[in-house]
């Protein structure tokens, strides 16, 4: 069975920001604006064609 | 610091595990410099087909 | 047409290096992934690594990481693939091979292929 | 490292015979599948990628199948000019693996 949709789990660091407690509610500035720069991000670095997006966001502590 | 888990979704066929991995490491130093974002500990790994149905992309 | 040249037959003694050239035609040289792959007597193909020439970019088979060194020339449109501390079981033919443009994950041009012989 | 494993290693079969031969990946690789044909003495010949899709200038004999684990490259009329070693490989992850090859001859 082919949906046509491949799909990935990527996980990484980033080591110069501090997590906090507004980095588990969405409905903060810093979570938006850090959701807005890696959805961002990911589309340049994956601007040739066959990307479709990304989902499922989520911060924890490093 | 933080740790960032998401799901990325591609049509079909057009990248391998590997390419995903590679052209976001080769990112690593942009997104230092454009988002203020230090980027390591890089972990890419390909979602099994029940769980892929379930997850909307974007 | 696209051709993949690659240098001569070469001889060697343990321990010695031997670096091998793929010289491309026909076709941008930056914006093909350039890979090397060896193939033993009566041995399976054995994937080696690649090169990305537009950016520099390397990836190595870990099983040679330490002995293997992939590099380029773009103003002569050559890849190169320098194996150190050769030993007999490195007597095989080593092939370069273009990988397909973007989102081709095959090889469509390979060199002549090389052989290179270990032997004290 | 995803391992390859064709099947068989070799086989010997009669003109116009319709010949099989199978790879299985030790892990998922999804369609990234490729075939090449080498011939003695020759540099190997990309046949078959993304499982199957056939290579322009490729005869329509020759086709493939198959995802995940399991794949199946078909000639459904051998000819003469068939007689070579066949290899799969993986294109899903590094080490870029390749099975190791069946020999095709004719009886």
């Known amino acids: 069975l082919s949906t046509g949709v491949s799909f990935f789990f990527l996980s990484f660091h980033i080591s110069n920001l501090q997590f906090n407690s507004s980095l588990e509610d969405p409905s903060t500035d810093y979570y938006q604006e850090l959701q807005r720069d890696i959805s961002e991000m990911f589309l340049q670095i994956y601007k040739q064609g066959g990307f479709l997006g990304l989902s499922n966001i989520k911060f924890r502590p490093g | 610091s933080v740790v960032v888990q998401l799901t990325l979704a591609f049509r079909e066929g057009t990248i391998n595990v590997h390419d995903v991995e590679t052209q976001f490491n080769q990112y690593k130093t942009e997104a230092a410099s454009r988002y203020n974002l230090t980027i390591s500990d890089v972990s890419v790994s390909d979602v099994p087909f029940p769980f892929s149905a379930q997850s909307g992309a974007g | 047409q696209v051709q993949l040249v690659q240098s001569g037959a070469e001889v060697k003694k343990p321990g010695a290096s031997v670096k091998v050239s793929c010289k491309a035609s026909?076709?941008?040289?930056?914006?093909?992934?350039m890979h090397w792959v060896r193939q033993a007597p009566g041995q399976r193909l054995e994937w080696m690594g690649y090169i990305n020439p537009g950016s520099d970019y390397t990836h190595y088979n870990q099983k040679f990481k330490d002995r293997v060194t992939i590099t380029r020339d773009t103003s002569a449109s050559t890849a190169y693939m320098e194996l150190s501390s050769l030993r007999s079981e490195d007597t095989a033919v080593y092939y370069c091979?273009?990988?397909?443009?973007?989102?081709?994950?095959?090889?469509?041009?390979w060199g002549q292929g090389t052989l290179v012989t270990v032997s004290s | 490292d995803i391992q390859m494993t064709q099947s068989p290693s070799s086989l010997s079969a009669s003109v116009g015979d319709r010949v099989t031969i199978t790879c299985r990946a030790s892990g998922n690789i999804h369609n990234f599948l490729v075939w090449y044909q080498q011939k003695p003495g020759k540099v190997p010949k990309l046949l078959i990628y993304n499982a199957k899709t056939l290579t322009d200038g490729v005869p329509s004999r020759f086709s493939g199948s198959g995802s995940g684990t399991d794949f199946t490259l078909t000639i459904s009329s051998l000819q003469p000019e068939d007689v070579a070693t066949y290899y799969c490989q993986n294109f899903w992850n590094v080490p870029f693996t390749f099975g190791q090859g069946t020999k095709l001859e004719i009886k």
């Open positions: 026909g076709y941008t040289f930056t914006t093909y992934t």
């Open positions: 091979a273009r990988q397909g443009n973007y989102a081709a994950y095959y090889f469509d041009y």
